[in-house]
């Protein structure tokens, strides 16, 4: 039962995490205009991985996609790649883990196969979470670097007269969504890996011992508990104890979505 709960919870946590990674990747607010000493602005700039937007205080918002591929910074391309890899791995992991769930019966799928699939999906979730965390962290580092560079160049002009105030960008909501989502996916993956161990308890093999009684020729083979390591397909003499009634709680989660030149 504990294994089922751990596996189910791992699946749900990963599902929320991957939904968050998708949301973060699609969000426009990866970087937002820093309102350092001016909390009220007539023109507010924010940027995502795919487009940059300008919101006027009048309410009019204009977004422009990055229609160039070669003209974009390599770091931005790298972040895009990391997020997409994270989403793809996560999606495959989710697909695998659905079939691996102990509470879902598909034909005569063996527990060893379910353990294998649980471990596979767990590893995929871990890598997916790491990709998202890495992507968001690379972008955050890029922002910090640019922030201090633009701060150094902020007050430029002839004779000390301010001509151009550079727009500085700070962390947007998508970064926090990405970090949290990546973390959740990572945790979900670890839980799936832990559940895999529970699905495949340690195997003890007892060799058959023959006892010769007078007048009879009887061979006694104790039917010991023979558990698979999770990678084999040995099903003879296997007994599985669930520890009582099986609870099949199906938890559904509904991911919530929020909103370089």
């Amino acid at each position: 039962m504990a294994v089922t709960a751990c596996q189910g919870l791992g699946f749900v946590v990963s599902l929320i995490g991957i939904a968050g990674i998708i949301a973060a990747t699609c969000m426009d607010q990866w970087s937002t205009q820093d309102l350092y000493n001016n909390p009220v602005t007539a023109v507010f700039n924010y940027q995502g991985l795919w487009r940059s937007c300008v919101r006027e205080s009048s309410g009019f918002t204009e977004c422009r996609g990055y229609f160039t591929l070669l003209g974009l910074p390599a770091m931005l391309q790298a972040v895009r790649a990391l997020m997409i890899v994270g989403i793809v791995l996560g999606a495959i992991g989710l697909l695998v883990s659905i079939f691996a769930l102990k509470c879902i019966r598909i034909g005569s799928m063996e527990d060893s196969a379910k353990a294998n699939m649980t471990l596979t999906s767990g590893i995929m979730f871990i890598v997916s979470g790491l990709c998202a965390i890495a992507g968001v962290s690379v972008f955050a580092n890029m922002l910090v670097t640019n922030f201090w560079m633009s701060t150094a160049n902020m007050y430029t002009g002839m004779g000390g007269m301010v001509q151009t105030v550079q727009t500085r960008y700070t962390f947007g909501a998508a970064l926090f969504v990405g970090w949290v989502a990546g973390g959740l996916t990572l945790i979900g993956g670890v839980m799936m890996c832990i559940a895999c161990r529970g699905l495949a308890p340690e195997e003890t093999n007892y060799k058959a011992v023959s006892y010769h009684a007078s007048g009879h020729s009887v061979a006694y083979k104790p039917g010991g508990f023979k558990a698979s390591t999770g990678f084999g397909s040995n099903t003879k003499n296997k007994k599985i104890y669930d520890g009582g009634a099986r609870t099949e709680d199906e938890v559904q989660s509904y991911p919530s979505k929020h909103d370089y030149v």
Partner: antibody, heavy 118, light 113 residues
Framework: QVQLQQSGAELVKPGASVKISCKAS????????MNWVKQRPGKGLEWIGQ????????NYNGGFKGKATLTADKSSSTAYMHLNSLTSEDSAVYFC???????????WGQGTSVTVSS | DIVMTQSPSSLTVTAGEKVTMSCKSS????????????LTWYQQKPGQPPKLLIY???TRESGVPDRFTGSGSGTDFTLTISSVQAEDLAVYYC?????????FGSGTKLEIK
Amino acid sequence: QVQLQQSGAELVKPGASVKISCKASGYAFSNYWMNWVKQRPGKGLEWIGQIYPGNGNTNYNGGFKGKATLTADKSSSTAYMHLNSLTSEDSAVYFCARWGTGNTMDYWGQGTSVTVSS
Amino acid sequence: DIVMTQSPSSLTVTAGEKVTMSCKSSQSLLNSGNQKNYLTWYQQKPGQPPKLLIYWASTRESGVPDRFTGSGSGTDFTLTISSVQAEDLAVYYCQNVYSYPITFGSGTKLEIK
């Protein structure tokens, strides 16, 4: 069509206060900022501030904080500006203007003349 | 606050002439996010409220005759009337709408001979 109808001219004594109105029609009043602009006789335009009727948020020009108070009534689609402690410096024509795309004042009221005289 | 400086303060021209007026801001009005200049031009005829002519420095408001053209970027802007008509007699104001507080230029008074 969008229309902004302002209240009539006011003649007030120094030290008194006045409340002028701007009734909007032809658009979703709650969804647009309403600006107030001052124009003294023969002079230029001065931005007083703006109010967002949807939630009552306001932005003021520092020079008018304490002098002008902006409010709005969604039910009647009317914006108000209250001017207090009036002096001769406050004698002017006051305009209300809608804040539109491009951060522009795209529609203006006809203006309300306020004369401060003893 | 951004200071808007208009020149000349007044000019007298004959109908059909081309006229240009200047507006300078103390700070750049160019927004890097969309490469738009947040400068607006208004026309105020005697006894009337101002009327929106041009926004984003060069975008003509609908209904405004095409003889009115806005140009410039950053801190230097120009309003050009290609062929002045009698009805263009007015005061023209430029306005910073890039950052609060919103500020206006002192105006250019256009008079017709």
